[in-house]
Structure formats: C-alpha cells, structure tokens
C-alpha cells in the first residue's frame, strides 16, 4: 500500500468524507503520518 505523504493525504480525505467529518481534531495528515496506514 502507498505510504507517501500524498497518498496519506488522499486516503485521509476519503476517510473524513465517509465519516461525515466526525473525527478527532488531530486527525490530520501531518499528525496521522504514513505509519497509520
């Protein structure tokens, strides 16, 4: 699976979209990082 910064950002955007934006405030690309995926 792709763990570049850009992949992480797009994947997170998808997760946010599917959750309706109901996630923790710190759930952002630079905090989550590639290790989360």
């Amino acid at each position: 699976s792709c763990n570049t910064a850009t992949c992480v950002t797009h994947r997170l955007a998808g997760l946010l979209s599917r959750s309706g934006g109901v996630v923790k405030d710190n759930f952002v690309p630079t905090n989550v990082g590639s290790e989360a995926f």
């Epitope: 570049t4 910064a5 950002t9 797009h10 952002v28």
Partner: antibody, heavy 119, light 107 residues
C-alpha cells in the same frame, strides 16, 4: 481563501545559494505536507521534496539531496526551500504546493519563483 | 525512479473535439496518479487525483481512468480555455515523477 504566496524572482551566480519562501494562509499550515517542485524552461515538472510542517521531517528527491534544504517557520506559516551550489541548470521556476483537505479539498500551488543562475 | 511517459507530446484539435492523452508508468503505481493543466507563465492547476477523481470545480468534461501502468485523461468536448499543456504525475513512491507533458494546440 487558501493562498500560497512565494517570494520574488532571484538572480544568482554559479556556486551561490538561493532561499525561496512560501507564505501560507487560509488553512492550518501545520496540518498538511508542503511540496516543492521546479520547472526548467521548456522542461517537465521535477519534484524536489516535501516537508511535514508539524514535525519538520523531510523527504528529498535523491537528485537534490545534499543541495536542497526544506525548512518551515511555523509561527509565520512559511515554508522555505534553499538550494546551494547553484549551476546554470538550476535556472527554473520553483513552486511550493500543498494538498489541503479543510476548508477546501484541493491541490494548491504558489505562483512560482523564477531563479536565474548566470555568471 | 519511476518514469512516466506521456503521449502524444502534442495534439492539434478544434473546439468540441474529444481529446485523449495517455500516460504510461515504468512500473505499477496503483491508482496513485494525478493530472495537471498548465498554461504559459502560470502555475499548474490540479484536475484529477487517484487516477479518476475530479477536484471540486473541475469541469465534468475532464475525466481520468486507468490503474497499474496505463492511464488516460480525456477531455470530452474541448473548450477554448482548455488549450494548454497537460502533465501526469505518479505519487505512489518517492521521488514523485511527472510525464513530459502533452500540449493541446488549436487546429
């Protein structure tokens, strides 16, 4: 409104260094990675590297490792790209770019900074 | 590094034409491809991410497809403002790399 505003054009001599700035506004600067890309006249786009503004962790294109240095000033919401040991082939337009999710999911680019290396 | 080979390097077309640009990666990049439009003297403008998803505000005449090594950008009905150079980019692995560009010119 998300904006990435870059510093002005530079003319440098071979062997010198240049530092380009990119001031971000309209979003939380530390939440999103900042990329740097360049484009020499008539050439394809070339990725230099990216930086996590939150941690300062960088990833570089090996082609530029040792010559390019990416940094941020979190308090000023500004990213910097410094390129050393300049040569004529470094003459290019340098761009900062960041993919933002909030407030608008989009891939934003700065207006570009022209760096000319000439003796 | 992954090479991204775009074709054609230029295409002459008329308003209303359907234009197809292809991009071939030298190795599997999944669906991790973006497309950009660039006009002379301007910054690149993002059109497509993840091979087939349009960014908000991008007209529906632009569509992307493909996965693995073969990708396509299609402009279904060319408009006057679409005359520009188009680049593909892979972001599946570092360093990110771009195609050589396709210039869409007025016939």
């Amino acid at each position: 409104e998300v904006q990435l505003v870059q510093s002005g054009a530079e003319v440098k001599k071979p062997g010198a260094s240049v530092k380009v700035s990119c001031k971000a506004s309209g979003y939380t600067f530390t939440d999103y990675y900042m990329n740097w890309v360049r484009q020499a006249p008539g050439q394809r786009l070339e990725w230099i590297g990216d930086i996590n503004p939150n941690s300062g962790v960088t990833t570089y294109n090996q082609k530029f490792k040792g010559r390019a240095t990416l940094t941020v000033d979190k308090s000023a919401s500004t990213a910097y790209m410094e390129l050393s040991s300049l040569r004529s082939e470094d003459t290019a337009v340098y761009y900062c770019a960041s993919i933002i999710i909030v407030p608008d999911y989009f891939d934003y680019w700065g207006q570009g900074t022209t760096v000319t290396v000439s003796s | 590094d992954i090479q991204m080979t775009q074709s054609p390097s230029s295409v002459s077309a008329s308003v209303g034409d359907r234009v197809t640009i292809t991009c071939k990666a030298s190795q599997n990049v999944g669906s991790n491809v973006a497309w950009y439009q660039q006009k002379p003297g301007k910054s690149p403008k993002a059109l497509i991410y993840s091979a087939s998803y349009r960014y908000s505000g991008v007209p529906s005449r632009f569509s992307g497809s493909g996965s693995g090594t073969d990708f396509t950008l299609t402009i279904s009905s060319l408009q006057p403002e679409d005359f520009a150079t188009y680049y593909c980019q892979q972001y599946n692995s570092y360093p990110y790399t771009f195609g050589g560009g396709t210039k869409v010119e007025i016939k």
